[in-house]
Interface confidence: low
């Protein structure tokens, strides 16, 4: 009775055990044994197949038969089978096991194929806790993670298997602890069209940090009230709070705060002045007598009720510039005119503080000549130190 079997195989290979006796033997049963333990029993001569060998299949094998007469009981030769490791248990390595949050990490699933079986193809898969990382199984033993965050802290491991799926091995688990960098240097910056904050226009409050990782919660405050104007949580070093249309009452001191789970850091206080465009000015005309007459001194007073100083006022007669006057601290400005017969007509003024110009309504004036006759068909109705009424 002879047992035919390979003496050396690799993990994943199939093993065929053949028990051979003389063909005319009449047997009741035959069996295959490993290390004196019965593996399988047949009623006639049959092969025994190990589909995919594992390391624990190594051992001493033999076969036996039981004949119809006791004299025919036989035992074969012993074949020592050694199942060799196809590839080593993988080891997970990382570019850093304590990476800085927001930075990259490279994972490697390292193993070695048997020198006799370098033709075998392996595939790899990486895991964190019980989640597959990346795109799953890949022929590359490396995985590049472009950025890790504090929530990526945990147990990592990898698996390696033959592409035929016969042999799969898993590494030990390794702890990766992602380090969070605290916030540093918080600053509040004002962004407005043209570089100045103007009523009715958009204002952006930009809160920035020089350093810090992870989810940063930015919040904006008005110093006078201490209450939060808004908050944003995002994975970035800056965040914007937009005020779509600034009001005059929005002027004041502001600061922002940033927090990523360590100590919240506050910016310096920034003062925001709100520039007010000029409103439509009102033109007031005053003369010494009851009727504006040639030779009189006519005072033109132009005033915009709203507007940030300095305000420049321009005075016009029939769209011809008479002159200008400035109000450095706001309020109105005056222009004096010695009347001649040609000064009848429409007067107007314009206010401009660099945020846009506004023109007053035209005020018509008629002037009496030295002979007492009116120089036009309309009466200005000028009274002493009173506004010249529309003609």
């Amino acid at each position: 009775l002879t047992l035919v079997a390979p003496s050396s195989v690799f993990e994943g290979d199939s093993i065929v055990l053949k028990c051979q006796g003389e063909q005319n033997w009449k047997i009741q049963k035959m069996a295959y044994h490993k290390d004196n333990k019965e593996l399988s029993v047949f009623k006639k001569f049959s092969d025994f197949l190990i589909q995919s060998a594992v390391l624990s299949d190594s051992g001493n094998y033999f076969c036996s038969t039981k004949g119809q007469l006791f004299l025919w009981d036989k035992t074969s030769n012993i074949v020592k089978i050694k199942v060799q490791e196809l590839f080593q248990r993988p080891v997970l390595t990382a570019s850093s096991f304590q990476p800085i949050e927001g930075g990259p990490v490279s994972l490697k699933c390292e193993t070695r194929l048997s020198p006799q079986r370098l033709d075998v193809q392996l595939q790899f898969c990486f895991f964190r806790e019980n989640q597959v990382l990346g795109s799953g199984w890949s022929s590359s033993p490396e995985l590049q993670i472009s950025a890790v965050w504090s929530e990526d802290t945990g147990s990592y491991w990898c698996k390696a298997e033959t592409v035929t799926h016969r042999i799969r091995k898993q590494s030990l688990q390794s702890q990766i602890h992602v380090q969070r960098i605290p916030i540093s240097n918080v600053s509040l910056e004002i962004r407005a069209p043209g570089g100045q904050v103007t009523e009715g226009q958009k204002l952006i409050l930009l809160c920035s940090v020089a350093g810090g990782t992870g989810n940063v919660t930015f919040s904006w405050y008005r110093e006078a009230t201490g209450t939060s104007m808004g908050k944003k949580t995002q994975r970035s070093l800056s965040a914007e709070l937009e005020i779509p249309a600034v009001k005059e009452s929005d002027a004041g001191k502001y600061y922002c705060r940033a927090d990523n789970g360590h100590v919240p850091i506050q910016s310096k206080v920034v003062n925001i002045p709100v520039r007010i465009p000029v409103s439509r000015p009102v033109l007031t005309l005053r003369s010494p007598g009851a009727q504006a007459a040639v030779g009189d001194l006519l005072e033109l007073h132009c005033e915009a009720l709203r507007g940030s100083p300095p305000i420049l006022y321009q005075f016009y007669h029939e769209d011809v510039t008479l002159g200008n006057s400035s109000a450095p601290s706001g309020g109105g400005a005056s222009f004096n005119l010695s009347l001649t017969a040609e000064h009848s007509g429409n007067y107007s003024c314009e206010a401009n503080n660099g945020l846009g110009a506004q023109c007053s309504e035209a005020v018509p004036v008629s002037i009496s000549g030295p002979d007492g006759y009116r120089r036009d068909l309309m009466t200005a109705g000028v009274t002493e130190t009173s506004q010249v009424a529309p003609a």
Partner: antibody, heavy 121, light 109 residues
Framework: QVQLVQSGAEVKKPGASVKVSCKAS????????MHWVRQAPGQRLEWMGW????????RYSQKFQGRVTITRDTSASTAYMELSSLRSEDTAVYYC??????????????WGQGTLVTVSS | EIVLTQSPATLSLSPGERATLSCRAS??????LAWYQQKPGQAPRLLIY???NRATGIPARFSGSGSGTDFTLTISSLEPEDFAVYYC???????????FGGGTKVEIK
């Protein structure tokens, strides 16, 4: 433990005003903002406004602007909400709610038991 | 103002089942979202703040997820005391305002 105890139910006529109180205990009253939220029968919760108890600053929902006034008395650890020009649709349960200390954002970790205000002629 | 829409309006489930409640915002609210539970005749109770953080004393079967405009409250295995109305609530940056969703009633099937 933190407790917010509100004043009792009120029945008011249309056009009148109502003032609901909310007495806080179990924490530093001036360290937390207090909000007021109402709930009409079978309706969703509706935010009315809040007060920064530390400095008295208030912010009101646009819907109630001009009709609601929220005040506080720090010596009595009590917040008040007064709603004027009452109409029948103001019939609701009014809650005071303490702003949470957990997150950065306005969530409410403790609530009063609610005060039913009925507006009826 | 931002409108919060909750779905479904009613959820009929048995104890032990998983409940999934949805809250959708008309525009992004980042992660400024909270969930509340309210039982008849009682004040609301804070469950989740900042979209996914459990409030103090809230059992682990309650969890929140989502950001931007779509948020979910999950109750992994319903207990008899979990049958109630659930509201989501947001805050917007500017002008500051707070709104609540219309609520989802979780009832016993």
């Amino acid at each position: 433990q933190v407790q917010l105890v509100q004043s009792g139910a009120e029945v008011k006529k249309p056009g009148a005003s109502v003032k609901v109180s909310c007495k806080a205990s179990g924490y530093t009253f001036t360290s937390y903002a207090m909000h007021w939220v109402r709930q009409a029968p079978g309706q969703r919760l509706e935010w009315m406004g809040w007060i920064n108890v530390g400095n008295g600053n208030t912010r009101y929902s646009q819907k109630f602007q001009g009709r609601v006034t929220i005040t506080r008395d720090t010596s009595a650890s009590t917040a008040y909400m007064e709603l004027s020009s009452l109409r029948s649709e103001d019939t609701a349960v009014y809650y005071c709610a303490r702003e949470g200390s957990n997150g950065w954002h306005e969530d409410f970790d403790y609530w009063g038991q609610g005060t039913l205000v009925t507006v009826s002629s | 103002e931002i409108v919060l829409t909750q779905s479904p309006a009613t959820l009929s489930l048995s104890p032990g089942e998983r409940a999934t409640l949805s809250c959708r915002a008309s525009q992004s609210v980042s992660s400024y979202l909270a969930w509340y539970q309210q039982k008849p005749g009682q004040a609301p109770r804070l469950l989740i703040y900042d979209a996914s953080n459990r409030a103090t004393g809230i059992p682990a079967r309650f969890s929140g997820s989502g950001s931007g405009t779509d948020f979910t409250l999950t109750i992994s295995s319903l207990e008899p005391e979990d049958f109630a109305v659930y509201y989501c609530q947001q805050r917007s940056d500017w002008p500051p305002s707070l709104t609540f969703g219309g609520g989802t009633k979780v009832e016993i099937k």
